[in-house]
Every structure is written in C-alpha cells, then in structure tokens.
Amino acid sequence: ASTQSPSVFPLTRCCKNIPSNATSVTLGCLATGYFPEPVMVTWDTGSLNGTTMTLPATTLTLSGHYATISLLTVSGAWAKQMFTCRVAHTPSSTDWVDNKTFSVCSRDFTPPTVKILQSSCDGGGHFPPTIQLLCLVSGYTPGTINITWLEDGQVMDVDLSTASTTQEGELASTQSELTLSQKHWLSDRTYTCQVTYQGHTFEDSTKKCADSNPRGVSAYLSRPSPFDLFIRKSPTITCLVVDLAPSKGTVNLTWSRASGKPVNHSTRKEEKQRNGTLTVTSTLPVGTRDWIEGETYQCRVTHPHLPRALMRSTTKTSGPRAAPEVYAFATPEWPGSRDKRTLACLIQNFMPEDISVQWLHNEVQLPDARHSTTQPRKTKGSGFFVFSRLEVTRAEWEQKDEFICRAVHEAASPSQTVQRAVSVNPGLAGGSAQSQRAPDRVLCHSGQQQGLPRAAGGSVPHPRCHCGAGRADWPGPPELDVCVEEAEGEAPWTWTGLC
C-alpha cells in the first residue's frame, strides 16, 4: 500500500448525556485510513490537567490501512474549555499535522427555518422601482448564525448590519432585508438567502414569478438529458405546449438564443389528445459546448387566439455541484415468483437534479422501457435522489448474473458516469472488476442515530447506523458510545456522529 495520510475526527458525547456533577470526562480523537504506522497524537488541554491513552492501531480489513483512537480524560472546569487534538503522520511528510479543536460535548440544537418574503406589487400588478426581499430565519436554538445573500448562486455584497435578532422563549429568530432594483428583479435571476448555523447550511430561494399564462394553455421547456449531453453528445431541448384548442390558426414556436447567435433547425410534432386538445412539441438540437458554457435558449409560442405570446427560457442549472452516489440492491426470492427478481438502484446526494439512469446487462444497455425511475426528489440535505427499478428474469441472470446501474450526471468524474454492479445471487457472484464495491467498516457514534435500523448491505450507512452503548469488540471505553459496524460504504471509516 502507498503512503496515505490519516483522516481525523473528534469523538465527543452529547452534552445532555453527561451528568452535571461529573468531575471528569473523556473525549477522543480518531485517526483513520493512514499508512504506514505510526501516527503521533498529542493534546492541548489549556489550563487543565488530563491523562491520555492512545489505543493500539487496528488494521482496516480491505485497504490494509490503519486506524487508532486517542482518548483524553480531563477533570476540573472542563465545561467551558476547548481542547485541541494534534495528529502528526511523519511518513506522509515530516511536517504533516492535522489539528481538531473542540469542546467536551456537542449540544442538541433546533435548526432554523428559512423563508423569503417579498414586497407586494402595486394595485395594477406592476412592480415598484425597488423590491424588498425579507429573509426570516426563525425558531433556532440561540447561537451564532451567518446570513449570506446569493444572486444566481453568486455571493452578493450586501450590508448585513441591518439584520436583527429577537428571542422568543428558548428559540431565536433573525431577519435580513435585501433591496433590489426593478431591473435586477425583472432579469429573472434567482435570489437565495443562505444561513450557516452550527456547521450546517439552510437556505430559501425566490425569483420573479412567470407572467400568468393565457388561461388553459401551458408551455414547458426541458433541459437536455445528461445522457444526450455527455454520452450521445447530441443534446436537444424540447418546447412543449399543451391544452391548445384545435382551431384554424397555426401555433408558432420560435427558437432564439440569448447571445443572438443563430439556432439549429428544429423538428415539430402535433398530436391530438383524447380530450380534444392539441399538444405541440418542438425539439431543438443544441451545441454541447454552447449548453455547457451557459447559453440561454428561448422558446416563444404565438397563436392568433392567445392574448399574448408565451415565453419560456432554459439554461444550464446554476449552483453547487455534487456527484451522485450509486447503490444497487437485489430483492430476495419472493414466494411464487422464483423466476423473476427486482433490482433496485438508489442514486443520491447529487446536484443539480438533472440525471439520466441506465441499466446494462453484459455491456448492453437495456431499453428505457425495461426500468422505472422516479423523478428526482430533494434529500433532507441539499442534494437530490432517485430510485430506479428493474425486473429481471431467471434466463437473464443465469446468462450473466451482473447488472449495472449507471447514473449519468455532470458532476460525476471522470466521464460523467457513476455505476454500480448488482447480482441476483450476491453471495455467488464471484467478484467482478466492475462492481466497484468498497466493503469496509463504518464508525458510528450514538446520539441521534441511536436505535435506528441497521443500514442495508450495500448502502451508505449514514445516518442509519445502529449504535449501542459501546461495544465489547471495539477497544474503547463504553462511556464514549462508539461502535463499529460492518457495512459497504464509499470510503473506509465514515464518521456519522451527529449529536
């Protein structure tokens, strides 16, 4: 194994679990994933006396890397004191050091709710010369919060001294105001109030609502699918107009680009629906580079019976990027359906929400009609997730018991794809280079996770780890509530201790 520097994690208890009369308390530092031995762990205890114990390193089963825990027991006035754990790994480099400064325990907190309110239009529905946005950050445990305003994902230079905080009972609220010119507001930009609190980010966004549509008629403009964009390299966007009443006049769909450059030739399709309405679609091929570089495309819909033109525009999604994590599972045999199995694929924590999901069997892409994939939905955090379901027959899995779930997403590197292999008979599938599995240990910390169900094999255990009050097979004192779970995860030793 090549030299690998450690990842360092603080080990703390929940404050509520420490008796108020405790005269001493233990905290810890985990150094994991390093190679070779040794690491040197030292503690800065400030003015307090403390005793340290560094446990013997253990070997991580698959990677051959090491992990160790150093424990510090302090007595006295520890409650207000900060402690620094300093981990040195000279094999990485003579000056390789990672410091973690933390207090004895982590407090429970109530996260804030973030909501943006906007000033009203005048009676005639027109916007005033300036528009006020008010960000309400409410119902959080008092503590430091940082408010940032973003315009299309970019930090704005805003005077935040006007932000005011009030306390109601045990919870606090803060509000911050942003004043925009009418020109900025009408430019169709997205404004975000981003709140950082206790190391977490909470946000709400708003933008000018689209003009109300002529009644009954709706227009939609799609973005290219990641599969068309990155794999086929022939992206298209589609303008869809629905609920048109069939009439003598012609519906015109006109394409344009914000840059003023010419557009490609589009293809148009009209379909009469069962309810008597007309659906019109126009598909426009776009340049891969143009799209990736942020060109905006507009579709303008006109019809003699429409009081005004409908305008729709689309461009590459702005904001943070995160690659998808892909986990694939096979359902066990179900009575009465011995010759069929369902495979499931969870794809999660990706941003933005545009994703394409494919299933492959023996390097051949299965038709899209074979699988069913949900629309992207938001996770509890800031990313998105989808599930995809594929039914396979015995004949298929006996030909080759390896099915690949592949996600195509702009943030996936190196080739915009992440894939995971799954077998119907996982115990018998005899390893494969494509499977990309990383079975390893996952370190959990009791607290909010305690008592939750165990992680399903193959999934990322965070945050569904079951932790007891210490484990006899892990060399740490029971009061640390540390346990080790065997699970399949992305990286050796995933810290999931959110108290």
Epitope: Q399, N425, S432
Partner: antibody, heavy 122, light 107 residues
Amino acid sequence: EVKLVESGGELVQPGESLRLSCSTSGFTFTDYYMSWVRQPPGKALEWLGFIRNKANSYTTEYSTSVKGRFYISRDDSQNILYLQMNTLRPEDGATYYCVRNKKVYYYAVDYWGQGTSVTVSS
Amino acid sequence: DIQLTQSPASLSASVGETVTITCRTSENIYSYLAWFQQRQGKSPHLLVYDSKILAEGVSSRFSGSGSGTQFSLEINSLQPEDFGTYYCQHHYGIPLTFGAGTKLELK
C-alpha cells in the same frame, strides 16, 4: 485444485437403468450449478442438463433428448452429483462428463471430469 | 434450439502458424459463446467464455471475438499442445448446445 471424478459407467442392456456419480473437491460445491454432458465415440459434445444450487431450490433443466428419462440430483453434504438414467437406449452409449457451471455466467461451464464410459448393447 | 455451425470441420497447420476457427449461431446470442479444446482421449478444457474472456490459466495466444451470430477463435503461434478438436458452445439460454467441432491437425 478443482477435481471432478465420475464413476458408475458400465455395459448395460437396452431398457435398463444406471446411476452415475460424480465426486467433487477443491471448491465450495454448494455454491455451484452442476451439469452433465456426454460425448458418443467420435462425435460432438451434447449437454444433458444441470441442477441449480440450494439458493436456487435445486431446480433442474434437461435437454429434450433425455427429458423424462434422465434425472439429475445432488448431495451437498457429500459434495456428490448424480445422474440417474432410465430406459437406456443404444444411442445413449457415450462418455459421460460431470461439469461445473461457472459463477456469474451460470449457463457457461468451466471444469470437466475425466469422464465415465457407458455402453448400451444387447 | 439454437444451432451452432463450426467451420472448417478440420484444418491442418504447422507449429508457429496462426489459425482462425469460426462459429455461426442460428440466432442472436449477443456475446454468450464459449470455446473448448479437447485433446485426443482427454476431457474438454475451457478456453474462452462470453466471446472474448480468456479462462484462468489459458495462454494469451488464444483470443476470442464476435457477437450476435458470428464468432471466431484465433490461435497465434501454434504450439504442439494446441492440436486437437475445438468446440464452441452458446451459454445464452436453455438448452445449451455445442458446435460439431473443428479438428486441428499437425500438417
């Protein structure tokens, strides 16, 4: 080392029955599907059938030429594969091979025994 | 049932030569085809499966290719131990069937 050793081949009369055994070692027998393949003298190979593993309920598949006359079974506790042949015909005379199916590619076969010879003649 | 047609039925070659044996199937079997070698008086021995994956311990002088209905096995730089009969077998579905064989003889 994977080893498959067939036994039980002999000279029998048409209409009689015969049971072939295949003793295995060197691999986890319970994990694998197992097949029988035969080869008449100077002719090509012919797949007779296979038996799935416990995880797949020990179900069997047969070629149309032997379906209803030949039966494959296994004893996972002894790591032995069996082929019960009933109502034998002269054209059943051949070398019978016990074969291990691959993992992942369950219809493909990898290791073969040395074969046992069956002659059907009056 | 899927029929497998091997050609040629037999061929003669000298040590050091390169030979190609083909196998045609009666229907599309994607890449699910295996090749076996059987020396005189011996059991068959797996060379290639899934059209192109070399079995464990098989010399890299052997290479498989093809998909759909047309497949071939190429043997480079023939060695004395390469002479014998070669069979193709599909592993696409039940029943599994073999080709009639190609006999490779020393010229």
